[in-house]
């Protein structure tokens, strides 16, 4: 068929909950390409009808929900003007009741369901929720040993659980839970995460580098919407938290009631030697009280700020 096989990806998944896989392989998928999903070498593509339990949504294959019989190899075919590439995804579905201790241990879970916290440090766990734009995710709840996590050492920030002053007792089995809404229907997503601890620094004591901002001011009109990215480079297995703060408080907490200023979801691009992280801050409406206040981007021990200022009056208008 003239298609070049790129790689095989193995995913081990829990039945009875949504799952999605995005067919991306930069730089191939960054150009003008068409993406088509197939199951088990079938010639018939996966349905694109959004009411179907299994359907293709743009470049994604979406299972609403995953069922035990969905195990198998799925192919994603990426066709360009002069090229054809194929990615194989081997899905293994298992029945797991996270809080049923009578059931044996978990299968060999993929790496994002195994995470490490660093003893004595402020660290975080990430709830990996990869879904297309058509899926709306509600707030995330976190559990340890089947009990909802509460306490001043723990803060939920977007898809992360921040853990301050990690102790040996923080190791064990965690789960993050969110409600996913798609076409008016609601589904529960529950990811189990096995969390181990280490004393090792892990990133060799490297200091993250904030590329932007650079401790500068930004001219912005009163009442406008403003989005500012914080771009950070760091080593691949760093344990640094990246966030926006104002008056030494997380912006999401500081503006908890009005939600006028919010931190965005962190994204990252992986390079050979490092990762480039981006986390933005959104001002839905710039108010007078925002001017002159340093909004700080934090990345581990590194910080950089922006200060909003009113544009200089344009006297030519008079």
């Amino acid at each position: 068929d003239g298609c070049k096989d790129i790689f095989m990806k193995n995913e081990i998944l829990s039945a009875s909950q949504p799952f999605a896989f995005n067919c991306t392989f930069p730089p191939i998928t960054s150009g003008e390409v068409s993406v088509t999903w197939y199951k088990n070498s079938s010639k018939i593509p996966v349905s694109k009808i959004i009411q179907s339990r299994i359907h293709q949504d743009e470049t994604w294959i979406l299972f609403l929900p995953m069922e035990w019989g969905d195990s198998g190899v799925y192919q994603c075919v990426i066709k360009g003007r002069d090229s054809c590439h194929r990615i194989h995804v081997n899905l293994t579905v298992f029945e797991k009741h996270w809080c049923d201790t009578s059931i044996g241990g978990l299968p060999n879970l993929s790496d994002e369901y195994k995470q490490i916290l660093h003893l004595g440090k402020d660290d975080s766990l990430t709830c990996h929720l990869h879904f297309p734009k058509s899926c709306v995710l509600g707030p995330i709840k976190w559990y340890k040993d089947c009990n909802e996590i509460k306490g001043e050492r723990f803060t939920v920030l977007e898809t992360r659980l921040l853990v301050s002053n990690v102790s040996a007792e923080d190791r064990g089995n965690y789960a993050c839970q969110a409600i996913l809404t798609h076409s008016g229907k609601q589904y529960e997503v529950l990811n189990g995460i096995t969390v181990s601890i280490t004393e090792r620094a892990g990133y060799g004591g490297s200091v993250p580098k904030i590329i932007y901002p650079k401790n500068h001011s930004i001219e912005v009109q009163l009442g406008t919407t403003l989005i500012v990215d914080c771009n950070v480079t760091d080593t691949k297995d760093n344990t640094n938290l990246r966030c926006w703060r104002v008056n030494n408080t997380l912006v999401d907490d500081y503006y908890d009631e009005s939600k006028r200023i919010r931190e965005g979801v962190e994204t990252h691009v992986s390079f050979r030697e490092h990762n480039l992280y981006t986390v933005n801050i959104t001002f839905l409406e710039v108010k007078m009280e925002d001017y002159g206040l340093p909004f700080m981007c934090h990345a581990g021990v590194s910080t950089a700020y922006i200060i909003l200022q009113l544009p200089a009056p344009d006297f030519r208008a008079y």
């Epitope: 181990s196 090792r200 990133y203 297995d237």
Partner: antibody, heavy 120, light 106 residues
């Protein structure tokens, strides 16, 4: 059950390179920390270094200019290279990993050890 | 570098005797790990996070300590306990082992 199987020569000539392989079954080397330790004659243990889940390497500063730890995730193997060996590098070399009771630093799983003699 | 000094270097005990071996650190250590090494075998994790016994380790063993002073105790020595015991720290790099305590049974 995690198992570590070591392979490599037991005799290396001075100034040459010592190369050892640790083949892992029952776990993926893309999670956790994968260590090398050696035991000198007379029972003196030295921690040599590790390669982490992301490929980050840590080396004992006493070996830094001579040691290299690499991996092949497709084979689920990791490797130790020690260049310019001398008779002082004669030891039993072990690969080991932790993760016991969710503690990465508790080195519970060990290879069988490779006794390496440096001699001409 | 954190130096771990184990004492005594060699100790001899009679069956049923209580023995304690010490591991002193040159700087504060958060947790101590202990390994048992017998001739011709690979080291075995014996005690982790200062006081937790690894799987298969008899309950007569215990670990304790904090800061710079740690110890491993056997409440009633048995013949199979004859081995060399090493302490190790991961608190500060370079990660180091103690010189070992060799336990002999009279």
């Amino acid at each position: 059950e995690v198992q570590l199987q070591q392979s490599g020569p037991s005799l290396v000539k001075p100034s040459q390179t010592l190369s050892l392989t640790c083949s892992v079954t029952g776990a993926s080397i893309t999670s956790g920390y994968w260590n090398w330790i050696r035991n000198f004659p007379g029972n003196k243990l030295e921690y040599m270094g590790y390669i982490s889940y992301s490929g980050y390497t840590y080396y004992n500063p006493s070996l830094k200019s001579r040691i290299s730890i690499t991996r092949d995730t497709s084979k689920n193997q990791y490797y130790l290279q020690l260049i310019s060996v001398t008779t002082e590098d004669t030891a039993t070399y072990y690969c080991a990993t932790g993760g016991y009771d969710y503690v990465e630093d508790a080195l519970y799983y060990w290879g069988q050890g490779t006794s390496v003699t440096v001699s001409s | 570098e954190i130096l771990l000094t184990q004492s005594p270097a060699i100790m001899s005990a009679t069956l049923g005797e209580k023995v304690t071996m010490s591991c002193r650190a040159s700087s504060n250590v958060r947790y101590m790990y202990w390994y048992q090494l017998k001739s011709g075998a690979s080291p075995k994790l014996w005690i982790y996070l200062t006081s937790n016994l690894a799987s298969g380790v008899p309950a007569r063993f215990s670990g304790s300590g904090s800061g710079t002073s740690y110890s491993l105790t056997i409440s009633s020595v048995e013949a199979e306990d004859a081995a060399t015991y090493f302490c190790q720290q991961f608190t500060t790099s370079p990660y180091t082992f103690g010189g070992g305590t060799k336990l002999e049974i009279k």
